[in-house]
């Protein structure tokens, strides 16, 4: 449940957090999870772990694997799985899909490409951009902070955008490369408050103790690509990841379809074997743009047994 | 500022449930590291921990009352909520929630607290 | 349980004076260096105040009068010089072990 996927490539510096949060003053300890060895808190090491932090400086194909850590509260400890994979470097321009980060979408107004993950290191500006492997240069592009802002966009600014940036380490450094797709709205296109199409508000859905369920928060945001259209499930009203019960689930990812021209979301929460104390619990479906937040309820209720009893002559 | 308000029932019977209601504002229970816990005082006594309740919904319990209590939270109404089954008059205190917060474990803020009288 | 003794049950300090409070642990609240100790005032009718956490770490707010020391099993709580906006209950209380435990309390007067 607490497992982050992580990647990078041979030779250039890798940090990874420990998916499982916790205060500042709080030891964590970092174990390769093959052979429950405990990974060395000395920096003269190349692999070593600081804190929430695991460093791979540089990293190595060979350090693929899974990595686990434990943040030890004083009265609580809290585990996590980092599943860390390293690829060897490309010799062509081609980045794999593999590699890629999150894909960002743009419009004429807003055109900002965050660097994905550069806030675990320690990196000094000016960052370095690329798209489709050309450094970018000319007066539309400004490197700001830890984005890259392009002015007047257009459609042919959509494609795959590589920033680098140099890690410091003890005076030593190290490179790192990050890479995501920029797509650039379809200006035909419009954002609207969000409408949510399932489930209906204050909706009542009849379950079996015992049998699995599915529950799908569906929602539309307006037409064409869409800058920020989430959603997602809670359990009165906290995330299903702070949820500490491994039967309810919210699906990985959200599948985006296009209904009508509209740009609409859904994620399935998949409910096993259904308790008693299920039918307890809020299920909000929430839906968030831009624009703001919509809730819809359901709760979950017994089925009757009338519905589904035999009559014997 | 960071402000925390109990609400509870006042009077209750023997074997009846209590229900307690923490309502704060100032900070969020989504926040790592954030977290609300229960502490009762009975009048003129001294102050008893009874549970607390972390952002990421790991709970915490006095061992000598588990059985009887249920700390929740409900983040997004800035909410935490303290059950506890079959009450006895030994449970007449002061009931305060009080947030932990800091770069360690400790509260920092406290309610004014919500009074229960069990009585027959 | 961690039990945590406090003494005097009940100190009388002149204004102007020290006043001291004691607290020990039935073992030691001691977490990476740091002791898990925290120091309470509560007033009549009044929900507790944190003073000192973490042994010696004066709370944002709180008079520079109030100080905390002491390490592993052994605490305490001064106070000076007193005043008379003083007078109260103080706690002591460790986060080490669960259950979090609260000392007996001691009732600060003026003489």
């Known amino acids: 449940k607490f497992s982050k996927q992580s990647w990078g490539l041979e030779n250039e510096a890798l940090i990874v957090r420990c998916p499982r949060q916790g205060k500042s003053s709080y030891i964590v300890d970092w174990y390769y999870s093959q052979t429950n060895k405990s990974i060395p808190t000395q920096e003269r090491n190349r692999v070593f772990a600081s804190g929430q932090l695991l460093k791979f400086l540089p990293a190595e194909v060979a350090d693929s694997g899974i990595y686990t850590c434990i943040v030890r509260s004083p009265t609580f400890n809290r585990t996590g799985y980092a599943n860390v994979t390293i690829y060897k470097k490309q010799p062509d321009c081609n980045v794999p899909d593999y590699l890629m980060y999150s894909t960002v979408s743009g419009s004429e107004k807003n055109s900002k490409i965050y660097c994905p993950t550069i806030d675990l290191y320690n990196w000094t500006a000016p960052l370095e951009w690329f798209k489709n492997c050309q450094a970018l240069q000319g007066s539309r592009y400004k490197a700001h902070k830890s984005f890259l802002v392009i002015d007047n966009v257009m459609t042919d600014d959509a494609g795959d955008y590589t920033c680098k940036f140099i890690h410091n380490e003890n005076g030593a450094n190290y490179s790192v490369t990050a890479t995501r797709s920029f797509t650039v709205k379809d200006e035909q296109g419009f954002s609207r408050f969000p409408v949510i199409r399932a489930p209906a508000h204050n909706e009542t859905k009849e379950v079996e103790i015992g049998e699995n369920t599915n529950l799908t928060c569906s929602a539309c945001f307006g037409k064409g690509a869409q800058f920020l259209a989430t959603v997602q499930w809670q359990l009165n009203g906290n995330k299903i990841t702070d949820f500490s019960e491994p039967r309810i689930q919210q699906e990985e990812g959200q599948n985006q379809s296009f209904s009508n021209g509209l740009a609409c979301v859904n994620t399935v929460l998949r409910i096993a074997d259904v308790k008693e104390e299920d039918l307890l619990l809020r299920y909000d479906c929430l839906a968030l743009n831009l624009h703001g937040l919509r809730r819809h309820t359901i709760r979950l209720s017994r089925k009757n047994p009338i519905d589904h009893q035999s009559t014997y002559c | 500022q960071v402000t925390l308000k109990e609400s509870g029932p006042g009077i209750l019977q023997p074997s009846q449930t209590l229900s307690l209601t923490c309502s704060f504002s100032?900070?969020?229970?989504?926040?790592?590291?954030?977290?609300v816990g229960w502490i009762r005082q009975p009048s003129g006594k001294g102050l008893e921990w009874l549970a607390h309740i972390w952002w990421d919904d790991v709970k915490q319990y006095n061992p000598a009352l588990k059985s009887r209590l249920t700390i929740s939270k409900d983040t997004s109404s800035s909410q935490v909520f303290l059950k506890s089954a079959s009450v006895d008059t030994a449970d007449t205190a002061t009931y305060y929630c009080?947030?932990?917060?800091?770069?360690?474990?400790?509260?920092?803020?406290w309610g004014q607290g919500t009074t229960l009288t069990v009585s027959s | 349980d961690i039990v945590l003794t406090q003494s005097p049950a009940s100190l009388a300090v002149s204004l102007g004076q020290r006043a001291t409070i004691s607290c020990r642990a039935s073992?030691?609240?001691?977490?990476?260096?740091?002791?898990?100790m925290q120091w309470y005032q509560q007033k009549p009718g009044q929900p507790p105040k944190l003073l000192i956490y973490v042994a010696s770490n004066v709370e944002s707010g709180v008079p520079a009068r109030f100080s905390g020391s002491g390490s592993g099993t052994d605490f305490s709580l001064n106070i000076h010089p007193v005043e008379e906006d003083d007078i109260a209950m103080y706690f002591c209380?460790?986060?080490?072990?669960?259950?979090?435990?609260f000392g007996g309390g001691t009732k600060l007067e003026i003489k």
């Open positions: 073992e030691s609240v001691e977490y990476s260096g740091t002791s898990l």
């Open positions: 100032g900070f969020s229970l989504s926040t790592s590291g954030m977290g």
């Open positions: 009080a947030r932990i917060g800091g770069d360690y474990d400790y509260f920092d803020f």
């Open positions: 209380q460790q986060s080490r072990k669960v259950p979090w435990t």
